[in-house]
């Protein structure tokens, strides 16, 4: 039985050219996290954090994606095309997979508000 819940940074906005932290947190489960996958809105993989092998950033994102903090991901040099959904998938033993959703809006405005609140989707 899957007892855990994924908390995410929910809906966030950030300034074009700036950076943003995508963060998911798994709680309320004894399960062991063996891998975390980060995907973009078009289902392309940005990065994988494997318990044994560590981080792997996919080549297309190497220049703009930094691992961490923790199991999260930092997106840098944001463009308008980065607007959209992002998903974290936690592979856990023995529960199975937990999936969290974050919506990022990249703003042209010079004073974009950076709202980052934790919520359960």
């Amino acid at each position: 039985m899957m007892t855990g819940t994924i908390e995410t940074t929910g809906n966030i906005s950030a300034k074009k050219g700036g950076s943003v932290i995508l963060q998911c947190h798994l709680s309320s489960t004894m399960a062991q996290v063996t891998q975390v996958n980060w995907e973009q809105h078009d289902h392309s993989l940005l990065a994988i954090r494997n318990a044994e092998l560590g981080w792997h950033i996919y080549p297309a994102f190497k220049d703009r994606v930094a691992p961490g903090p923790g199991l999260g991901l930092t997106l840098q040099s944001l463009t308008m095309n980065d607007t959209g959904e992002y998903f974290c998938t936690y592979h856990t033993y023995p529960d199975g997979t937990y999936r969290g959703r974050i919506f990022l809006e990249v703003l042209e405005s010079s004073v974009a508000e950076h709202s980052a609140r934790f919520q359960i989707p």
């Epitope: 062991q32 063996t34 891998q35 318990a51 044994e52 592979h91 033993y93 023995p94 199975g96």
Partner: antibody, heavy 122, light 107 residues
């Protein structure tokens, strides 16, 4: 190479306690969950539960609560199974087994200890 | 809890035979199933995971198939060392139960 080496066979009297050790080598101990499996003489495999090697939190299957304790010493890459108040029906081979595979669809017990025979007899 | 039922419990066959062992789950487990081989007095050995993926080093005469609730382990041509016991196990959440085992005996 990746291996799990268990402590040797043990003969105990009813009411006594026993501790079985499982020493891991050849991989990062805290990256893989560890399981305990019992096999009574002439019987099949019975999953007793597992321990989260990151947090040390154990999970016990129904029927293996109370007298059974899973623990870790990550400084020496070793998992332990302790059984207290031993009964004749605890006589069995006890295996430790690593959960291999990193994604949910690829989990399996890919590395096993050689097994430890625990005999409970007066 | 998800229960696994293996059939047959005993199987008599000859060297060179093709044999199939079935494992049925009491509810859908996708493809989260593994098969193990156990020699008497030894630890089980992983043969197949994810229902059909052959573990490294395992001979290609072993194959697995199925998804959902019905799975099979096939040995295409039995060798003398294959006359042992086989177990299926689901890894679709807690508890990760094993089937009761299938003993393959020489006819």
């Amino acid at each position: 190479q990746v291996q799990l080496v268990q402590s040797g066979s043990d003969l105990k009297k009813p009411g006594a306690s026993v501790r079985v050790s499982c020493k891991a080598s050849g991989y990062t101990f805290t990256s893989y969950p560890m399981n305990w499996v019992r096999q009574a003489p002439g019987h099949g495999l019975e999953w007793m539960g597992w321990i989260n090697t990151n947090t040390g939190n154990p999970t016990y299957v129904q029927g293996f609560t109370g007298r059974f304790v899973f623990s870790l010493d990550t400084s020496v890459n070793t998992a332990y199974l302790q059984i207290s108040s031993l009964k004749a029906e605890d006589t069995a081979v006890y295996f430790c087994a690593r959960t291999g595979g990193h994604t949910y669809d690829s989990y399996a017990f890919d590395v096993w200890g050689q097994g430890t025979m625990v005999t409970v007899s007066s | 809890d998800i229960q696994l039922t293996q059939s047959p419990t005993f199987l008599s066959a000859s060297v060179g035979d093709r044999v199939t062992i079935t494992c049925r789950a009491s509810q859908v487990i996708s493809s989260s199933l593994a098969w193990y081989q156990q020699n008497p007095g030894k630890a089980p050995k992983l043969l197949i995971y994810a229902a059909s993926t052959l573990q490294s080093g395992v001979p290609s005469r072993f194959s697995g198939s199925g998804s959902g609730t019905e799975f099979t382990l096939t040995i295409s041509s039995l060798q003398p060392e294959d006359f042992v016991t086989y177990y299926c196990q689901h890894l679709h959440g807690y508890p990760c139960n094993f089937g009761q085992g299938t003993k393959v005996e020489i006819k």
